[in-house]
Interface confidence: medium
Amino acid sequence: AMHVAQPAVVLASSRGIASFVCEYASPGKATEVRVTVLRQADSQVTEVCAATYMMGNELTFLDDSICTGTFNESRVNLTIQGLRAMDTGLYICKVELMYPPPYYLGIGNGTQIYVIDPEPCPDSD
Amino acid sequence: AMHVAQPAVVLASSRGIASFVCEYASPGKATEVRVTVLRQADSQVTEVCAATYMMGNELTFLDDSICTGTFNESRVNLTIQGLRAMDTGLYICKVELMYPPPYYLGIGNGTQIYVIDPEPCPDSD
């Protein structure tokens, strides 16, 4: 298994955007790396988003994904947007070195993302 | 020492208000209880506010205090207002049974209060 580090706590901005770094210890030079963000809340785990990084290309999530990210050697800078207070939870970074073999899997301990819904702005008269 | 319980984490509202309960295990029926909120950040501890509860009266903080609270048996409901992102930190509840003797002191493990500054509302035209 592969060691994956991520921050313990992150606060989403009042616009519902949270960013954190997911860093992994790689035993070799992978040309294909898959990054998945999982959310754990009430012992339920759901997939938030996933992307595959091919060496030389960008880290690309699906068009309708709430995640964006950049890749720099063994560091993945992740940004999750559109978060609401109800999305507060533990966000786990899962990294897979897909190719070439040997395949390695690493799962972080999770980043607790706290989200506070903003107060609505007063109507302009 | 007296056991004091308080939540591990609390999120301030987008208005900068954070509320939490500080509960203590009292070995007797005290008629005078002093409650102090301390803030720990970067290994520095500062006093945020303090109030003394006299049985039959209300829990009264100073007029210019950022704290308010109510007392119910051995539970203190504390509210801290006017918080900004820079006020994020560990807020420790300290309870002293002042009268009658014997004097008891209890200090909680602290509540991590996270504060996010709101985005400014757009100017009305």
Epitope: A1, G28, P100, P101, G106 | -
Partner: antibody
């Protein structure tokens, strides 16, 4: 049940090539890696190399110029070829199923979980 | 390449005793470590994978522990069938090098 069996020449002259075949049953070479390990008489184990489910190979750095590992999935056979033999290549040669993460599995650690009985090779004129 | 240093090289013990064999990696191998047992004239057999997990059919008197660069194999209440040679192997990126081995002999 998982079985592996090595077959080799027994005696090889110095400077010649060694060819050993490992025939497996009970698992598919398209799903698992297969490692080669040797053990000189009275000495410890030396990992030589591995061929993965997709035909990718990794070798011990000291043998990279002399060692070839290939396979025939349809015959469930893996082949080791070691060139330019010297007397210190005299050893028992083992093949071993290399359990662990392959694409799409759910398990994060590697091990050589099943071994053949070994084939003894003597390099001598 | 990652080097594996195993100690002691040999050990003479009696049936019923407890022994501990240690293995040190030259760098962090993140618990990607296996232990094998080899009896005279036989092929090695997997005992422990992922530093702490017992392989199928391995008696519970065997236990693995450790993390980072330091790992150990403990055998409680040694049985006569436990005598032989034990090897550790790292599996954190190739080459998957072995330790030098520990020969366990009956006193």
């Amino acid at each position: 049940q998982v079985q592996l069996k090595e077959s080799g020449p027994g005696l090889v002259a110095p400077s010649q090539s060694l060819s050993i075949t490992c025939t497996v049953s009970g698992f598919s070479l398209t799903s698992y890696g297969l490692s080669w390990v040797r053990q000189p008489p009275g000495k410890g184990l030396e990992w030589l190399g591995v061929i993965w489910y997709d035909g990718n190979t990794n070798f011990h750095s000291a043998l990279i110029s002399r060692l070839t590992i290939s396979k025939d999935n349809s015959k469930s056979q893996v082949f080791l070829e070691l060139n330019s033999l010297q007397t210190d290549d005299t050893a028992t040669y083992y093949c071993a199923k290399t359990e662990g993460h392959y694409y799409g599995s759910n398990y994060g650690y590697y091990a050589l979980d099943y071994w053949g009985q070994g084939t003894s090779v003597t390099v001598s004129s | 390449d990652i080097q594996m240093t195993q100690s002691p090289a040999s050990l003479s013990v009696s049936v019923g005793e407890t022994v501990t064999i240690t293995c040190r990696a030259s760098e962090n191998i993140y618990s990607n470590l296996a232990w094998y047992q080899q009896k005279q004239g036989k092929s090695p057999q997997l005992l422990v994978y992922a530093a702490t997990n017992l392989a199928d059919g391995v008696p519970s008197r065997f236990s693995g522990s450790g993390s980072g660069t330091q790992y150990s194999l403990k055998i409680n209440s040694l049985q006569s069938e436990d005598f032989g040679t034990y090897f550790c192997q790292h599996l954190w990126g190739t080459p998957y090098t072995f330790g030098g081995g520990t020969k366990l002999e009956i006193k």
